[in-house]
Interface confidence: medium
């Protein structure tokens, strides 16, 4: 056989030894067919491959794990446990792999995995203990620091009939296993509504990403017990107005950075504590970008130009003055 | 010297079965992937099964999928291939052959072949 | 399934003068790192035997008069200068992913 490739670290198919007698010591890590392993990085990639499931051979050495671009559609119970574990597993990607469905107990027997990227995914059927592994009332604290779920909005026909936020929320809460939760990345997932208890119960996040999604008001949700959080991403939604308890717990944290572009703020006498709040605070990034959507007469007016004389509310007409 | 011997070839009728052996020598066999390939006579190659060094990965051509199983014996340094239900389409010259050391590129090295004929 | 396109079906060559093989995959069988084509040749009666690996690597004990290049869809197996020793049938293959798919075949004689 021929000499690996010194191209790169990378290596798949080329050959790993330069004889083939019988006297080789054992080579006690392969790299499955259909990936490219690099134990100098310990790093497996099975990218773009078409697999059907996840390969069993993975080499123990494995701390990065790309398994992108493939078609796992479900991701049974101990997916990725291993004998011996695979115990240095940090960042596993499993994004555009067409998974419908993530079963309790998936990601067991990853002592070490802190990041889980399951983006681009149509997630029909998320268990509640796909990332907790038992359906105890407390678990075993999860070592995840970072979980991305960017659109794993499955299709309109293909969705439970239950609310698809629920489910997500049902999840990250379960047993209480993710407390050290430090990024949650929930966008383009055609949010609604926020779950009022989702972040009390995520003390340790830093970074949360909602864009993109379509929420309406933030009304319920509380930011108070996220001391840590230094990133709320907001931009992209279908928000009209931020209301005082919103502003004041916003401003309260002491880290924060807020993003709010490109949301369709309805500029009347409702916005005015909004708008006197962007003024005097420093935590919204691109303050001077926001702009009015509504009402037409006030279509593309900067916030923190208005001032209260613009901000009005057509007087509300009595029943018997009102036309159909 | 790496050597690949297959054997268990024969006549056999539609619907029946068979189970082809390849002999490995002359490397350590528990580090190598291994694939059964065929060539139908006057054909071209087709690729039939593979199977990862320590057994834990299986995959197969749709042709032979839930009639066709490939395993292996590390201790005996043999790979097998258990055809059932045989079809007169899987009448072919049926190879063996390693994938290369810790990476999966070509397939270095080959046996002469065991010739299976399919007929009533 | 990818398919693998060989051109020409075969190829009648003076000893002495070169000869190139195609090789079209129907999509890319290629990574930012490597490319899943090898090249067999077989010869009469025989088993295929390895050329190049991962498109332009050649396999140990192969004559350095082949040669493989290619990236993508689009290969190519070259002998700078045929002998009488190369007749036989040469295929592609490429293992990017299940089912791992050979072209058809060309097969080279000599004038």
């Known amino acids: 056989s021929s000499p690996t490739s010194s191209a790169s670290s990378f290596s798949s198919s080329a050959p790993f030894l330069a004889s083939a007698v019988s006297a080789q010591p054992p080579l006690p890590d392969q790299c499955p067919a259909l990936c490219e392993c690099s134990e100098a990085a310990r790093t497996v990639k099975c990218v773009n491959r078409n697999l059907t499931e996840v390969p069993t051979d993975l080499p123990a050495y494995v701390r990065n794990l790309f398994l992108t671009g493939n078609q796992l559609a479900v991701l049974p119970a101990g997916a990725f446990a291993r004998r011996p574990p695979l115990a240095e597993l940090a960042a596993l990607n499993l994004s555009g792999s067409r998974l419908d469905e993530v079963r309790a107990g998936a990601f067991e027997h990853l002592p070490s995995l802190r990041q889980l990227d399951l983006s681009h995914n149509p997630l029909a059927d998320l268990s509640p203990f796909a990332f907790s592994g038992s359906n105890a009332s407390v678990s075993a604290p999860s070592p995840l620091v970072e979980l991305i779920l960017n659109h794993i909005v499955p299709p309109e026909d293909e969705r439970q009939n239950r609310s698809f936020e629920g489910m997500v929320v049902a999840a990250l809460l379960a047993g209480r296993a993710l407390q050290g939760l430090r990024r949650l990345e929930l966008a383009s997932n055609h949010f609604l509504y926020l779950p009022r208890d989702v972040l009390a119960q995520l003390p340790s996040l830093r970074h949360l990403d909602l864009s993109n999604n379509s929420l309406v008001s933030l009304t319920y949700v509380s930011f108070r017990n996220l001391t840590h959080l230094e990133s709320l991403h907001l931009e992209d939604n279908a928000l009209k107005v931020l209301h005082n308890g919103t502003l004041a717990e916003l401003q309260g944290l002491p880290h924060i950075r807020v993003f709010l572009d490109n949301n369709p703020w309805v500029c009347d006498c409702h916005m005015a504590d909004m708008v006197t709040w962007l003024k005097e605070t420093e935590v919204v990034q691109g303050k001077d970008r926001l702009t009015c959507a509504y009402p037409e007469k006030m279509r593309n007016r900067v916030l923190l130009e208005l001032n209260s004389a613009d901000l009005d509310c057509d007087p509300i007409l009595p029943p018997s003055l009102q036309t159909s | 010297e790496v050597q690949l011997v297959e054997s268990g070839g024969g006549v056999v009728q539609p619907g029946r079965s068979l189970r082809l052996s390849c002999a490995a020598s002359g490397f350590t066999f528990s580090n190598f992937g291994m694939h059964w390939v065929r060539q139908a006579p006057g054909k071209g190659l087709e690729w039939v099964a593979y199977i990862s060094s320590g057994s834990s990965t299986f995959y197969y051509a749709d042709s032979v999928k839930g009639r066709f199983t490939i395993s292996r014996d590390n201790s005996k340094n043999t790979l097998y291939l258990q055809m059932n239900s045989l079809r007169a389409e899987d009448t072919a010259v049926y190879f063996c052959?390693?994938?290369?050391?810790?990476?999966?590129?070509?397939?270095?090295?080959w046996g002469q072949g065991t010739t299976v004929t399919v007929s009533s | 399934d990818i398919v693998m396109t060989q051109t020409p079906l075969s190829l009648s060559v003076t000893p002495g003068q070169p000869a190139s093989i195609s090789c079209r995959a129907s999509?890319?069988?290629?990574?930012?790192?490597?490319?899943?084509m090898h090249w067999y040749q077989q010869k009469p009666g025989q088993p295929p035997q390895l050329l190049i690996y991962?498109?332009?690597n050649l396999e140990s004990g192969v004559p350095d008069r082949f040669s493989g290049s290619g990236s993508g869809t689009d290969f190519t197996l070259k002998i700078s200068r045929v002998e009488a020793e190369d007749v036989g049938v040469y295929y592609c293959q490429h293992s990017w992913e299940i089912p791992y798919t050979f072209g058809g075949g060309t097969k080279v004689e000599i004038k």
């Open positions: 991962s498109s332009s």
């Open positions: 052959a390693r994938s290369p050391a810790y990476y999966r590129y070509g397939l270095d090295y």
């Open positions: 999509q890319s069988v290629s990574s930012s790192t490597f490319s899943y």
